[in-house]
Amino acid sequence: AIVFIKQPSSQDALQGRRALLRCEVEAPGPVHVYWLLDGAPVQDTERRFAQGSSLSFAAVDRLQDSGTFQCVARDDVTGEEARSANASFNIKWIEAGPVVLKHPASEAEIQPQTQVTLRCHIDGHPRPTYQWFRDGTPLSDGQSNHTVSSKERNLTLRPAGPEHSGLYSCCAHSAFGQACSSQNFTLSIADESFARVVLAPQDVVVARYEEAMFHCQFSAQPPPSLQWLFEDETPITNRSRPPHLRRATVFANGSLLLTQVRPRNAGIYRCIGQGQRGPPIILEATLHLAEIEDMPLFEPRVFTAGSEERVTCLPPKGLPEPSVWWEHAGVRLPTHGRVYQKGHELVLANIAESDAGVYTCHAANLAGQRRQDVNITVATVPSWLKKPQDSQLEEGKPGYLDCLTQATPKPTVVWYRNQMLISEDSRFEVFKNGTLRINSVEVYDGTWYRCMSSTPAGSIEAQARVQVLEKLKFTPPPQPQQCMEFDKEATVPCSATGREKPTIKWERADGSSLPEWVTDNAGTLHFARVTRDDAGNYTCIASNGPQGQIRAHVQLTVAVFITFKVEPERTTVYQGHTALLQCEAQGDPKPLIQWKGKDRILDPTKLGPRMHIFQNGSLVIHDVAPEDSGRYTCIAGNSCNIKHTEAPLYVVDKPVPEESEGPGSPPPYKMIQT
């Protein structure tokens, strides 16, 4: 059976704050848990969502979270279902609202000596307590000429007189918090001697050097006074105008006219009406100078035929807000159709090639007009001017494959070789028109090539096979100098390739024929037993019908290969003594000897006073030190051959004789003693 370990419980919650309804279930098998609100499944939102089996509220909402929650656990396999206890929230909240006139029914009916009732539309749970204010000053309950009813949230003025005139606001507070009226009520109870607004000035926006007019009228008995002030409290009259308002005129009806408006005239103008009694009435209006900034540039746009696209025109900053319209070919775009204006957007539906061109966004206000062009290109699928052709390209020469296409905008061409993208390098170059150049054609360039030409509207491709016309060439070219060992068998290979398999033959350079013990077998010169007379210059000739012949000259030297007569031996020497490493080699041409010590060649010209290489090839090292220890290699070489042999040199301390040892006792290892 399904058992609830934790069940949701009813709880207090605060509007807009976090909350959690807990639910934990134990069951024999897996179950899935979901929540009901008033019997309907709860859908997860960012505000209210399942957290494990519990239901989490990021921000409690008094309207959406009122009702009964229930946790349901279901074993989908058996169909068993268990339901938790019901739980609900006692949501505490407070919400601002306006101050409204409850009695009389309309402001027009308010007369001196009538009863006026105002209601504070702040609501909440638990019910808040209310405080009333007139012109920001708290009204305490129990004052003689007004009463406050907290239950009905009402303020009653009885009887209402001019002294009650003012701005009425209310605030309320509860355990949840505090709120004040979102809209206040101005109570105006006529006292004929109080100034009353007949016509209030309005904010105006004017272009530079244009004129601006503010209207302002008050009424009272006796008639009220009217005065205009500019920002810095400077009075404006027809007799005393401030220096920056030389072109200001105040008319008898209270209107203020400003001509040839300049930036310094912009600002706040105050119209002050003063009755015989009562406070002055101050009305404000602002004079703004019209302005319009530049428009940002458009990037050129590329669209595809048949699609729907939009280009947004961001209106420039300006005062008043500039109006925006689009034009094409000097004609203003309609607000519906296939190509039309929607808000600030240019809309092109089912784009046709003919829609390409320059579209202009215009913005205008009192300060002037701005415009910005956008170039629209309608992309077309490329078409062929010249496809790549199957080609025969000559090895070693540059080769070209065409891929000439046309489209709007200019198409992009890429080449593939054996399905692999060709990246431009020292061998491959793609020209602006799409032609591929292979700088020096090689045999392995003979394969499939494919070019693809693309625009945003689509792409086309074609392929061609390249056949490489091979050069007649030696593969590899024979070494120009070669050695043969005297009295031994020797071979000198020569091979070549070409468009047709070439014939290969050998000749002596002097034109004499090859002796009978020398054979030419399919390009390989074979000496059964090398004699001194076999030395000399030979020519390998490769030829075929279409390509003629090529020649390679080889100088053959007959040599006796190097052997060592004397090889250096493993040598141990006392420190400070002299070491001798012997080495003698023979061969024809007579070999030269070089020594390598501790991985570097010993240069006879830079050996220093301690080392010397004798004519016969031996190496002598005087006054040996431990750092002279290591492997020494004797290298014998001539123009035909090179051979080496090596031996280690050990440098040791001379032992101090012990008393038991006589002066003639031998050292513990073989020594060179000098």
């Epitope: 899935h32 019997g39 499944p41 859908q43 997860d44 989908d76 169909g79 068993e80 279902e81 268990a82």
Partner: antibody
Framework: EVQLVESGGGLVQPGGSLRLSCTAS????????MNWVRQAPGKGLEWVGI???????YYASWAKGRFTISRDTSKNTVYLQMNSLRAEDTAVYFC??????WGQGTLVTVSS | EIVMTQSPSTLSASVGDRVIITCQSS????????LAWYQQKPGKAPKLLIY???NLASGVPSRFSGSGSGAEFTLTISSLQPDDFATYYC??????????FGQGTKLTVL
């Protein structure tokens, strides 16, 4: 033994109504959800609707309005009321408790 | 409307083969795991194989396994046996007590 037996199937004319019953034995409907599933001849399974342990019902979008699931806990029986029947409602109708326990199904044929 | 798509619709295989059937939902199932697989043979009621995506139902051989999450699920038969040739259905459960079946995959002998 826990089992489900459907009944009430048969031939009905287009536009007509039919009520199928699913009688449960070996358990109480109070604690279980019951599904109705149908299968047209040679076609796949199609979920019709569900009645949960409290008696609340939920339906596939195509079944809303024409089909109604109800239950009588005293008879331990779940019902499927089908109105305005069409030829395409011809199918074997199964009732199932959860995923595991299914009835043998009852055939409904809508034809003139 | 929720749509569950099984692929393939039909599948031919031999005894011993490894078989995979996929099920894709147009929206995520409840808790990302409320998905079951059934086997049905002609004239019989469906038989539960897998529940909650990967749990093996009682009496079902271990060669059947399920995996997936959210809106994409698979049923795998590791080594097909003669008794496994049948039609297989996936069924998803969704927020709001709504359920739906896939169109089915018919597994036949190659």
């Amino acid at each position: 033994e826990v089992q489900l037996v459907e009944s009430g199937g048969g031939l009905v004319q287009p536009g007509g109504s039919l009520r199928l019953s699913c009688t449960a034995s070996g358990f109480s409907l109070h604690n279980y959800v019951m599904n109705w599933v149908r299968q047209a001849p040679g076609k796949g399974l199609e979920w019709v609707g569900i009645i949960d342990s409290s008696g609340s019902t939920y339906y596939a979008s195509w079944a809303k309005g024409r089909f109604t699931i109800s239950r009588d806990t005293s008879k331990n029986t779940v019902y499927l009321q089908m109105n305005s029947l069409r030829a395409e409602d011809t199918a074997v109708y199964f009732c199932a408790r959860g995923l595991y326990l299914w009835g043998q199904g009852t055939l409904v044929t809508v034809s003139s | 409307e929720i749509v569950m798509t099984q692929s393939p619709s039909t599948l031919s295989a031999s005894v011993g083969d490894r078989v995979i059937i996929t099920c894709q939902s147009s929206q995520s199932v409840y808790n990302n795991n409320l998905l079951a697989w059934y086997q049905q043979k002609p004239g019989k009621a469906p038989k539960l194989l897998i529940y909650y995506t990967s749990n093996l139902a009682s009496g079902v051989p271990s060669r059947f396994s399920g995996s997936g999450s959210g809106a994409e699920f698979t049923l795998t038969i590791s080594s097909l046996q003669p008794d496994d040739f049948a039609t297989y259905y996936c069924q998803g459960g969704y927020n709001g007590n709504i359920y739906a079946f896939g169109q089915g995959t018919k597994l036949t002998v190659l």
